[in-house]
């Protein structure tokens, strides 16, 4: 069912913002819920259309918001309307001038059919006027001017719904914007009457929730649910099931709540007046204040919850003590059950004293026939029966009845059975990409025969002439990728589509056969690549032993990174090495290696090496000297790839001395990149060169770098910025 | 529509190399495994090479083997074909073909290839 | 490698009769066999698949048939669109992806 609720803030227009919110609580709503001006019950108001825009702080909402300066074109008979599978239900709702000549008693006023009716307007302005009565637009009623009293009344002796409507009040000269508004709702039936013929007795509707002449069903005020409206909300929630909040600092004040007809409109519980700003006086409590607390025992009177009963006690003046009959009441049975064909076990779970038995329960089909359970069991709180079909069809679908008849009453609930064929895809999956050892497979979920919607997927799969189960895999997306498949192996592939609910595995649908790629070997072991020469590089691997008979060779192919060049070579099987020649000196190469038979196997990771130099290395760069302390320093560099560097070497001397007074310190290890210098003299002054070696000789410094260590006693000194880590 | 169209092919020399494009569209290229098919003038339909569709396998004919090289360009939905050291005998409508269940379901329209001295 | 050979070369046949052409592997190809047209100066065109499967779009005068090593194509009522060559393809066992040497089917 809907529940729709219109928020009116603030029915009477000052110079304040004021809005329309029409919530769609706890439904989802097929059609866009609409706000538009209710012309049927004021015809003569303002045309222009409204701006409706989403209510940003809730999904289901809409919100029309007028500013200050629109204060002239607001009065007037406003509707919310939600649409679900065709029905409409429609709340509405009025706004007028709080410097009105008159002002309503009440926005709403709901009365039953045949009730002694006055409708009142309090005078809020003296004129020296007739005062007119219309409704829905039409003159009914005027007093003369001398005549006009402080509660202006419409007296209904005998009311009828054809007297409901919008009644408004004004003085001759005013318009529509001096005008009261107040609605009449008029319920079809009389009082605690409904049903088609009003032959119905209502349920006792607490919290002055109204009865509903159509259903029978309470509709809680704002602040009050179930089905009494006996059970209080939390603070400042509402709705059929409380999930609702006022957002305000002081909860639902200033909130005027709209409910469908026959509700009307009313403040939240708590709150009273026409703009639902006035809290409840003590021992009040309720939608408008309405409700007296009169607790028993001395229990508390909370202005939103009515009496707060101490543990034990219950009933809205808590006066009711220990384990009374109840009424049985079939719990956690959902309206609509959507049932996989084969076999069905629906249960019927209700509560109530004395708990239901057995035989007191019972499963009523469409076509009439009666089931009783064929197991039963219950706990504290609740029977529970469980029922047998063994094999329901699609043409069992239709409303079921759970009945429970027992002492305390008798309770029976509809529910919708939907039964869907399981699902089975009409074509076989698609093989769109395999190797030897994987296979892409599109599943071809859709089209499929049966009912949606799919729940999850199975794609099985077996080798063929193998004896083994099919193994399964759930797949997410249409295309899945299988791993770890055999080599030159014929395999069967099917889909099984599983919708929601038990049961809901469909068959699995069409088989396709495909066959894996004969396999390549796997790459040569070992493999290293190194330098030979300017021009060559040589790369070897372990020797191969195949487990087959076929013919095989080594596939190397090689790749400049610079250049675009790309040579693969055909190696004998039997060889362990293979020289790349008429290579570019000082050039870096990208190797990698397989091993084919019929088949190709399957490439080694890319090996990566550089051809010697052909010309001297460039010096270390960005060399830095940095710690130094009395008989220490750290020098660092960096040197350039592609040179074939092979060593560098750190020469220093005191300076002054003798050419061949140097130290050499030859670092062999190219990737060295820092070095600590020890065993220097303190307070002494050192030059230092720093060159690179590679096959053709080496670097040539352009200039000395200087190293004055420190004396003994000081900190260590830094002179080439940055942080070295040795 | 899935649509396959070739180029690159040329007139050239026995021992030089050439390379073949087939631009993809229509279909999620990335995913499909992709093959060359080749047919000399007057003959019938032989397969060339496949390449998989994230690259990673690759196959080849034993005729080709070793002088030709499948790759693809997944970003640019292009497939290629590299053709070094071409022989007379590979002279033919080169064909780009999308692989379904093994079997190729589209075609292209070919490209001519003559190795000719 | 899987040899498959199609015969006859040539098959002559009047628009509106019946064709049948043959396919025969030198192994087993269980039912990895596919059909395709071919007319001149265009590329082929799938057929059948699987050995029987019509793909999408074709007419079903054409139907395939066969298993194991013994396949057939069948053109219940020749068109006049229909003459071209006829190439059957096995995928069972690669690599390599082999076809026929095809099937010439012209107006008699």
């Known amino acids: 069912a809907m529940d729709l609720i219109l928020i009116n803030s603030l029915p009477l227009v000052s110079d304040a913002e004021t809005s329309l919110t029409c919530i769609a609580s706890g439904w989802r709503p097929h059609e866009p819920i609409t706000i538009g001006r209710d012309f049927e019950a004021l015809m003569n108001q303002h045309q222009d259309p409204l701006e409706v825009t989403q209510d940003v702080t809730r999904e289901w909402a809409k919100k029309v918001v007028w500013k200050r300066e629109k204060a002239s074109k607001i009065n007037g008979a406003y509707f919310c309307e939600g649409r679900v599978r065709g029905e409409a239900i429609r709340i509405r709702t009025m706004k007028m001038r709080q410097q009105a000549s008159f002002l309503p008693a009440t926005l709403t006023m709901t009365v039953d059919k045949g009730d002694n009716v006055n409708i009142s307007f309090k005078k809020v302005l003296i004129k020296e006027e007739d005062a007119v009565i219309y409704k829905n637009g039409s003159f009914i009623h005027s007093v003369p001017r001398h005549e006009v009293p402080d509660i202006l009344e419409v007296h209904l002796p005998h009311a009828q719904p054809q007297d409901a409507g919008v009644y408004s009040a004004r003085y001759i000269g005013g318009n529509l914007f001096t005008s009261a508004f107040t609605r009449l709702i008029v319920r079809r039936c009389e009082a605690q009457k409904w049903g088609p013929e009003c032959n119905h007795l209502c349920t006792a509707c607490m919290n002055n929730g109204v009865c509903h002449e159509d259903t029978g069903e309470c509709i809680c005020p704002p602040g009050f649910m179930g089905r009494t409206c006996e059970k209080a909300c939390e603070l400042h929630t509402f709705g059929r099931t409380c999930k609702e909040r006022c957002s305000g600092q002081e909860g639902c004040k200033s909130y005027v709540f709209c409910l469908p007809d026959p509700y009307g409109c009313s403040c939240a519980t708590g709150w009273k007046g026409l703009q639902c700003n006035e809290a409840c006086h003590p021992g009040f409590y309720g939608p408008d204040c309405k409700l007296r607390c009169s607790c028993n025992n001395g229990e508390m009177c909370d202005r939103f919850q009515g009496c707060l009963c101490s543990p034990g006690w219950q009933g809205l003046q808590c006066e009711r003590e220990g384990i009374q009959r109840m009424t049985p009441k079939i719990v956690d049975l959902p309206d609509h059950i959507e049932v996989n064909s084969g076999k069905f076990n629906p249960i019927c779970k209700a509560s109530g004293w004395p708990l239901p038995t057995n035989e007191e329960m019972t499963l009523v089909k469409p076509d009439g026939t009666v089931l009783h359970p064929k197991d039963f069991n219950h706990t504290d709180h609740f029977s529970v029966a469980i029922f047998t079909i063994h094999r329901i069809l699609p043409p069992d679908s239709g409303v079921w009845v759970c009945s429970v008849n027992t002492v305390a009453g008798m309770v029976e609930k509809p529910f919708n059975i939907s039964v869907k064929v399981l699902p089975k895809p009409l074509n076989a999956p698609n093989v769109i990409d395999t190797g030897h050892n994987f296979a892409v497979i599109n599943i071809s979920s859709e089209p499929y025969f049966g009912d949606g919607p799919i729940k999850s997927k199975k794609l099985l799969y077996k080798p063929v002439n193998h004896y083994e189960a099919w193994q399964h895999i759930q797949v997410t997306n249409e295309i899945v990728t299988l791993n770890y498949l055999e080599p030159r192996t014929e395999y069967e592939l099917c889909v099984q589509l599983v919708r929601r609910g038990e049961g809901g595995e469909g068959h699995p649908g069409p088989v396709r056969r495909f066959t894996t790629a004969s396999i390549g070997l796997p790459p040569p072991r070992g493999l290293n690549l190194l330098p030979k020469s300017q021009t060559t590089l040589n790369l070897t691997w372990q020797p191969i032993f195949p487990s087959s008979e076929d013919d095989f060779y080594v596939e190397v192919e090689r790749r400049s990174v610079q250049k675009s060049d790309q040579q693969n070579i055909k190696v004998p099987g039997n060889l362990t090495s293979v020289l790349l020649n008429n290579l570019h000196p000082r050039e870096q190469y990208v190797v990698r290696a397989r091993v084919n038979t019929k088949a190709q196997g399957e490439w080694s990771e890319d090996l990566t090496a550089w051809t010697l130099s052909d010309i001297l290395p460039p010096q270390p760069e960005n060399i830095k000297i940095s710690n130094i302390t009395h008989s220490s320093a750290v020098i660092s560099w960096t040197i350039l790839d592609g040179y074939s560097i092979s060593s560098i070497t750190i020469r220093y001397k005191v300076q002054g001395k003798n050419e061949d007074q140097h130290v050499d310190v030859k670092i062999k290890n190219a990737t060295i990149t820092q070095y600590q210098l020890k065993g220097l003299e303190p307070e002494t002054a050192y030059q230092v060169d720093i060159f690179a070696e590679n096959n053709i000789g080496s670097s040539n410094p352009a200039f000395s770098h200087e190293l004055v260590t420190l004396p003994e006693s000081q900190a260590p000194a830094d002179l080439g910025g940055g942080k070295m880590l040795l | 529509d899935v649509q396959l169209v070739e180029s690159g092919g040329a007139v050239v020399r026995p021992g030089e190399s050439l390379r073949l494009s087939c631009a993809a569209s229509g279909f999620s290229f990335d995913i499909y495994g992709m093959n060359w098919v080749r047919q000399a003038p007057g003959k019938g339909l032989e397969w060339v090479s496949r390449?998989?569709?994230?690259?990673?396998?690759?196959f080849y004919s034993e005729s080709v083997k070793g002088r030709f090289t499948i790759s693809r360009d997944n970003s640019k939905s292009t497939l290629y074909l590299q053709m070094n050291s071409l022989r007379a005998e590979d002279t033919a409508i080169y064909y780009c073909a999308r692989t379904l269940n093994n079997f190729f379901d589209y075609w292209g329209l070919g490209t001519l290839v003559t190795v000719s001295s | 490698e899987i040899v498959l050979t199609q015969s006859p070369g040539t098959l002559s046949v009047s628009p509106g009769e019946r064709a049948t052409l043959s396919c025969r592997a030198s192994q087993h190809v269980g039912g990895n066999l596919a059909w395709y047209q071919q007319k001149p100066g265009q590329a082929p065109r799938l057929l059948i698949y699987d050995a029987s499967n019509r793909a999408t779009g074709i007419p079903d005068r054409f139907s395939g048939s066969g298993s194991g090593t013994d396949f057939s194509l069948t053109i219940s009522r020749l068109e006049p669109e229909d003459f071209a060559v006829y190439y059957c393809q096995q995928y069972y066992d690669w690599p390599p992806l082999t076809f026929g040497g095809g099937t010439k089917v012209e107006i008699k």
């Open positions: 390449i998989s569709g994230n690259g990673g396998s690759t």
